[in-house]
């Protein structure tokens, strides 16, 4: 969370940004809020990126002004126009690229004053893992798969019964480069599992952490997965 203040004569407005992460190939949001102002025609929003000449996006007089937009962002940006009046200056970024990572500035001017705040935008790939029982193996095993990760993550297994146990000796993890030659498919197999136990497959890089849980009993298999972005908010 980054809060910036701006001074315009006697007036300053608070601008707040949130560090966030983009999943490459998907759409992302760079979050920025400011003190609301009902006078839409007096609101100017400018998004800038460190090291880039020209603007990422500009919104003024109630509409986009892309005359100074840098070509790397052409056709990829939009503000939430109906939300600007309530202080939402967040930027929607289409088809996030690895090169979109960096420091951005959200600059705001309203009839009340002006202000700005920076945000760090991280880019990478992250996806939910899916765990299945691998019945083809010679001994009962679990297969944890996640289709898209970058940078290369670490993978660890845990078990509810054997808490603190190190499963690295009884697991095998591989990373397979996807067709676009950036992201990788993660596959990890855990051998010698026992029934009536809950196992967790944890995949983590510097952007995200994902966990897949599986509980295998005689009668059923229960799965749960979750994903959280790191260093956000």
């Amino acid at each position: 969370l980054i809060i910036g203040f701006g001074i315009s004569g006697k007036h300053f407005i608070t601008v707040t940004t949130f560090t966030s992460a983009g999943n490459i190939g998907e759409d992302g949001t760079l979050s920025c809020t400011f003190e609301p102002d009902i006078k839409l025609n007096g609101i100017v929003i400018q998004w800038l990126k460190e090291g880039i000449k020209g603007l990422v996006h500009e919104f003024k007089e109630g509409k986009d002004d892309l005359s100074q937009q840098h070509e790397m962002f052409r056709g990829r940006t939009a503000v939430f126009a109906d939300q600007v009046v309530v202080g939402n200056a967040s930027l929607r970024l289409k088809n996030v690229q690895l090169t979109d990572a960096g420091t951005y500035t959200c600059y705001i001017r309203t009839s009340k004053g002006k202000g700005n705040a920076n945000l760090e935008y991280k880019t990478g790939a992250f996806s939910m893992p899916e765990i299945n029982v691998d019945y083809n193996a010679s001994s009962e095993s679990l297969r944890c798969e996640a289709p898209r990760w970058f940078p290369q993550p670490t993978v660890a297994w845990a078990s509810q019964v054997d808490q603190g146990a190190n499963f690295s000796e009884v697991s095998n993890t591989s990373f397979e480069l996807n067709s676009e030659n950036v992201t990788m498919k993660v596959v990890s197999v855990l051998y010698n599992v026992t029934i009536n136990n809950t196992y967790s497959c944890m995949i983590e890089n510097d952007i995200a952490k994902a966990t897949g849980d599986i509980k295998v009993t005689d009668s059923e298999v229960k799965r749960r997965s979750q994903l959280q972005l790191l260093n956000s908010g």
Partner: antibody
């Protein structure tokens, strides 16, 4: 779902102050950023925006009514209020409260206020 | 203040007809134009916001277009429940102002 309900006297004497309250139910008035607004409609006529307030206390009034209007908010009661002073027969109207972003998406059902001695 | 002029002020149409209502702003309001439907004794109901975005729950026969100063509300196939008064409203510059309304009546 969010509902708005206007309340207040239906009859006000000329030169007195009209006071209305809008009670928000089904959600908190503070949960997000909205312009809590008042709009009126004289009998058989069109709609007129009176003004709006943010929970921060910032107010915005129609210049044609600004000298007579006060809008306030009470987050503890989940209510916002309208006061219109020095009323005349021209202030007779149905008064609506509404929630707004850059559009008025949730409205109360309206309350008729007649200004008469 | 920005003046909003609606036309026509009233029209008669039959069920199934395509109906078009126009709204003109006295200065550019970008796309900050909203459309409401009001039935007698009821509060207005939001139909279209941001000139062309359909409000959740509103039938797809309603559509909006335009930007700048000229805007249109279209009902592609008029239904019995659509007979009402329609208002445009700008939220670009306070005071927010409404058009005078268009009453859609049964022919």
């Amino acid at each position: 779902q969010l509902q708005l309900q206007e309340s207040g006297p239906g009859l006000v004497k000329p030169s007195e102050t009209l006071s209305l309250t809008c009670t928000v139910s089904g959600g908190s008035i503070s949960s997000s950023v909205y312009y809590w607004s008042w709009i009126r409609q004289p009998p058989g006529k069109g709609l007129e925006w009176i003004g709006s307030i943010l929970v921060s206390g910032s107010t915005y009034y129609n210049p044609s009514l600004k000298s007579r209007v006060t809008i306030s908010v009470d987050t503890s009661k989940n209510q916002f209020s309208l006061k219109l002073s020095s009323v005349t027969a021209a202030d007779t109207a149905v008064y609506y409260c509404a929630r707004a972003v850059s559009f008025l998406d949730v409205w109360g059902q309206g309350t008729m206020v007649i200004v008469s001695s | 203040d920005i003046q909003m002029t609606q036309s026509p002020s009233s029209l008669s149409a039959s069920v199934g007809d395509r109906v078009t209502i126009t709204c003109r702003a006295s200065q550019s309001i970008s796309s900050y134009l909203n459309w409401y439907q009001q039935k007698p004794g009821k509060a207005p109901k939001l139909l279209i916001y941001g000139a062309s975005s359909l409000q959740s729950g509103v039938p797809s026969r309603f559509s909006g277009s335009g930007s700048g100063t000229d805007f249109t509300l279209t009902i592609s196939s008029l239904q019995p429940e659509d007979f009402a008064t329609y208002y445009c409203q700008q939220s670009y510059d306070p005071p927010w102002t409404f058009g005078g309304g268009t009453k859609v009546e049964i022919k």
